[in-house]
């Protein structure tokens, strides 16, 4: 999904679906700023480093991000 | 289930306006972004603009910028296209659209606007 | 700005496989939709993300992409096939992303 390059919000709709672990190259967190109000989560996908925006408020990705957060614990020494 | 109704078509004239509005219903409306997409008669789709989930970002095809503003009240489920300055390429069916992230998921059955010279 | 290119038609007998084709430059570095519209219909998703399928659309509507071009394909082709199928990706190089759609093609069963 395309992303805005302006110093507002970044995504164009948030997706209640999570999405595979194992398909993540990397998990953004934005937070709210004085630009965007809300805090905004940016999956990149290994497949193409295809953006997709993540909904905060969904359980499903509440529970995405504490296993993406889990697993990287387990791999810190 | 997922439903869009364009409304506010109909006949115009040349350099006038005509603002369209989309209902949407059956899905967080507040969470997704938006399209408008229209099609001449007899030919292809011609994407036009595109407004982000909560408004604070609008993207405009050439061919409109300027001329047509997107809008959204996501308080009312309502997605808006203002159109200024019609010309009579105008002419077309206009559909709103759902974004989901990449693909246009679900469309409306499209409302039809003729611009008369 | 960026540019796709479709076959204007495609025709193919009922049984038979259709090829589609969607041409763009490293249009194997985008993510790819197809939509199928019958005549007097809106457009219908029927591949999104190069090769995935929306629920309720058959199996045999699938989609794959090479470097310079995507190919939606379908197997064994109904009567009720006949439509117009138009490719679509969003267009980040630009100062604002776009949408942009591939002329169409006209897919006859004969």
């Known amino acids: 999904v395309p992303l805005s390059r302006t110093v507002r919000c970044t995504c164009i709709s948030i997706s209640n679906q999570p999405v595979n672990p194992r398909s993540l190259e990397k998990l953004e967190i934005i937070p709210a700023s004085q630009f965007c109000p809300r805090v905004e989560i940016i999956a990149t996908m290994k497949k193409k480093g295809e953006k997709r925006c993540l909904n905060p408020e969904s359980k499903a990705i509440k529970n995405l991000l504490k296993a993406v957060s889990k697993e990287r614990s387990k791999r810190s020494p | 289930q997922v439903q869009l109704v364009e409304s506010g078509g109909g006949v115009a004239h040349s350099g006038k306006s005509l603002r369209l509005s989309c209902a949407a219903s059956?899905?967080?409306?507040?969470?997704?972004?938006m399209h408008w997409v229209r099609q001449a008669p007899g030919k292809g789709l011609e994407w036009l603009a595109v407004?982000?989930?909560?408004?604070?970002?609008?993207y405009y095809a050439d061919s409109v910028k300027g001329r047509f503003t997107i809008s959204r009240d996501n308080s009312n489920n309502t997605l808006n296209l203002q159109m200024s300055s019609l010309r009579a390429e105008d002419t077309a069916l206009y559909y709103c659209?759902?974004?989901?992230?990449?693909?246009?998921?679900?469309w409306g059955r499209g409302t039809l606007v003729t611009v008369s010279s | 700005s960026y540019v796709l290119t479709q076959p204007p038609s495609v025709s193919v007998a009922p049984g038979q496989m259709a090829r589609i084709t969607c041409g763009g430059n490293?249009?194997?570095?985008?993510?790819v939709q197809w939509y199928q519209q019958r005549p007097g219909q809106a457009p219908l998703l029927v591949v999104y993300?190069?090769?995935d399928r929306p629920s309720g659309i058959p199996e045999r509507f699938s989609g794959s992409y090479s470097r310079n071009t995507a190919t939606l394909t379908i197997s064994r082709v109904e009567a009720g096939d006949e439509a117009d199928y138009y490719c679509?990706?969003?267009?980040?190089?630009?100062?604002?992303?776009?949408?942009?759609f591939g002329g169409g093609t006209k897919l006859t069963v004969l």
């Open positions: 659209a759902k974004d989901a992230g990449g693909p246009l998921d679900y």
């Open positions: 059956g899905f967080t409306f507040s969470n997704y972004g």
């Open positions: 407004i982000s989930y909560d408004g604070s970002n609008r």
């Open positions: 490293n249009i194997g570095d985008k993510s």
């Open positions: 993300d190069d090769s």
């Open positions: 679509q990706v969003w267009d980040s190089s630009s100062d604002h992303p776009e949408v942009v």
